[in-house]
């Protein structure tokens, strides 16, 4: 009886694992083995595919074959018993095009209200992704074990920290890789779960802001308790994209080591042009807080984010404020070609009660003022990019008296 050729050959490539699967054509015939040959582009001869000769099952692994993953390859298969079937040719394919990204390796660290995720490619020193290793980005799905409500986080790098979590709570997550340059989306990792720790005695510092004063940077933050010491560290932001090493060498800002106030001042020349990450930690001598959320600090934006200049038109029950571009030393306006948001603080001259208005527009109305009353106004600019979180210093306060009643028109 003539042996039939095997059918429906599937090639599965995940990272550097090359798997072939096929269907037997005739289930009734026992003790059949299967063998594959392969042919490279531009070659006439067929070569035996090592790892896939005389296979008794319907699956084989040819990962040991050292192929050029960018070169087209053709496969053929036949069944063998006493005689052999005719060859069945598989459509030619390029391994790199066909390959899927495997599940990444995931390690988790827990804090009280944060989780640190360390991600690395599932196949170390992969041949398939050798030219693309630096281009991997990752996305994850995270949920509270108790609720199952999922949150997706896209475009993260090999180390990512998720903040604002609850203490003593189990969170689960899964991660997949992507190579956006090749339009490849990978397979999810297994689910990893970790429980956040008990709440730390000392919370981390919050609301970190950098501003420029003279030739110095002024770094400020908020803290819950008094009599603390703080330290500030920096890291080049691009290092977060480096998948190679899991050690981030955060560096101390010398003037911000063991400071006893919730601010520190350091010369602008501490940092060359670039984008940095900053973080702050508190200590009371016995206990240390976890690190604050990291803020992005762009020296280019920071240096030029100057306080806004404004004019006030006074009415009886309101001020109209017109915000203009800040002036440089030569009285020329600074062109700030990124979107800004303005924070305007105003108060009655005889009171400390401040009120705040946040506006994207450059003409702002401050309503509900009393006639014939002196009000003071100061303003500052913020970048609208949440990640960069840049703020200018406040402008000098300008004080004006409202007009007598009935002049609101």
């Amino acid at each position: 009886k003539n042996l039939k050729s095997p059918q429906k050959v599937e090639v599965d490539i995940i990272d550097d694992n090359f798997i072939l699967r096929w269907n037997r054509s005739d289930e009734s015939v026992g003790n059949v083995t299967f063998s594959f040959d392969y042919q490279k582009t531009g070659m006439d001869n067929w070569i035996k595919l090592s790892g896939c000769q005389n296979i008794t099952s319907t699956k084989c692994n040819f990962s040991s074959l050292k192929l050029n993953v960018y070169e087209e390859i053709k496969l053929r298969i036949r069944a063998e018993k006493e005689n052999t079937s005719s060859w069945y040719e598989v459509d030619s394919f390029t391994p790199f095009r066909k390959a899927q990204i495997g599940p990444p390796e995931v390690h988790l660290e827990a804090e009280d209200k944060a989780i640190v995720i360390h991600i690395s490619p599932g196949t170390k020193d992969s041949v398939m992704w050798a030219l693309d290793g630096l281009s991997f980005t990752y996305s994850l799905v995270i949920w509270k074990n108790s609720s199952g409500v999922e949150e997706r986080i896209e475009n993260i790098y090999s180390r990512h920290k998720i903040y604002k979590l609850s203490p003593e709570t189990t969170y689960c997550l899964k991660v997949k890789a992507a190579l956006l340059t090749s339009w490849k989306i990978g397979v999810y990792s297994p689910v990893h779960c970790i429980k956040t720790t008990v709440e730390n005695e000392l919370p981390p510092p919050e609301n970190i802001e950098v501003s420029v004063q003279n030739q110095n940077y002024v770094l400020k933050w908020d803290y819950t308790y008094a009599n603390m010491t703080f330290q500030v560290q920096w890291l080049h932001a691009f290092l977060k994209r480096n998948p190679g090493n899991h050690l981030y060498k955060w560096k101390q800002i010398p003037d911000c080591e063991n400071v006893k106030t919730t601010q520190c001042v350091f010369p602008q020349n501490v940092f060359q042009k670039g984008i940095y990450l900053l973080r702050v930690q508190a200590s009371d001598g016995n206990n240390t807080s976890f690190w604050s959320e990291e803020i992005k600090f762009d020296t280019e934006i920071q240096a030029f984010l100057l306080p806004p200049v404004f004019n006030i038109r006074s009415l009886s029950d309101s001020f109209h404020i017109y915000i203009g571009a800040p002036k440089q030393s030569g009285n020329t306006p600074v062109i700030q070609d990124y979107p800004l948001i303005y924070e305007i603080i105003f108060w009655e001259n005889t009171s400390n009660a401040e009120r705040k208005i946040i506006e994207k527009k450059t003409d702002v109305t401050v309503p509900n003022l009393k006639p014939l009353t002196v009000y003071c106004v100061k303003a500052r600019a913020h970048t609208m990019d949440e990640k960069l979180n840049k703020s200018s210093v406040f402008s000098d306060a300008v004080c004006e008296k409202t007009k007598p009643g009935n002049t609101s028109k």
Partner: antibody, heavy 118, light 107 residues
Framework: QVQLVQSGAEVKKPGASVKVSCKAS????????IHWVRQAPGQGLEWMGR????????KYAPKFQGRVTMTADTSISTAYMELSRLRSDDTVVYYC???????????WGQGTLVTVSS | DIQMTQSPSSLSTSVGDRVTITCKTS??????VAWYQQKPGKAPKPLIY???YRYSGVPSRFSGSGSGTDFTLTISSLQPEDFATYYC?????????FGPGTKVDIK
């Protein structure tokens, strides 16, 4: 493969200094921190400090501050730990170890016994 | 400085036994705890990092757990080569510190 090979045993007089070396191979010393840990006979492990060989930034345990100096020569992939004003209780084994972020101290040198005796 | 206590300080046990060593830190260190095994005259051998991850080549009978201030090293079925001293280590904040050690010997 990754290895840290330390210099040989030393005998020193009280008040003298000792400099222990730690030669790294199988990895780029600039990408890691090198830590120093010591152990008295029959006692536990005691952390002394660490150096970032890339820029020579150091952190020392308060107990050794002013008496220990950690340095590195990246051109020969070697870190050094010098301890001055030696006392008899500095008779211990000194270890160097590679620090790899959340992987902690993942590779250790074989140890160097320093004996302080008059 | 973060203080570390380990218990028990020593234990006598037999091959095949399940062994649990605990480590307490004086403040919350997240999961920044590692465990090392040391035999006489040898350098410490890394077993566990980041509380619960085994270094490559470490047998699966070794496991770590815990977080915050309480950590545990478990040897599920003690083997003859496991008789040694075990140290926990915090690498959350400087100065880094080690536990005093737990000596596991033959009953």
């Amino acid at each position: 493969q990754v290895q840290l090979v330390q210099s040989g045993a030393e005998v020193k007089k009280p008040g003298a200094s000792v400099k222990v070396s730690c030669k790294a191979s199988g990895f780029n010393i600039k990408d890691y921190y090198i830590h120093w840990v010591r152990q008295a006979p029959g006692q536990g492990l005691e952390w002394m400090g660490r150096i970032d060989p890339e820029d020579a930034e150091t952190k020392y345990a308060p107990k050794f501050q002013g008496r220990v100096t950690m340095t590195a020569d990246t051109s020969i992939s070697t870190a050094y730990m010098e301890l001055s004003r030696l006392r008899s209780d500095d008779t211990v084994v000194y270890y160097c170890a590679r620090y790899h972020g959340y992987w902690a101290l993942d590779y250790w040198g074989q140890g160097t016994l320093v004996t302080v005796s008059s | 400085d973060i203080q570390m206590t380990q218990s028990p300080s020593s234990l006598s046990t037999s091959v095949g036994d399940r062994v649990t060593i605990t480590c307490k830190t004086s403040q919350n260190v997240g999961t920044n705890v590692a465990w090392y095994q040391q035999k006489p005259g040898k350098a410490p051998k890394p077993l566990i990092y980041s509380t619960s991850y085994r270094y490559s080549g470490v047998p699966s009978r070794f496991s770590g757990s815990g977080s915050g201030t309480d950590f545990t090293l478990t040897i599920s079925s003690l083997q003859p080569e496991d008789f040694a001293t075990y140290y926990c280590h915090q690498y959350f904040s400087y100065p880094y510190t080690f536990g005093p050690g737990t000596k596991v010997d033959i009953k």
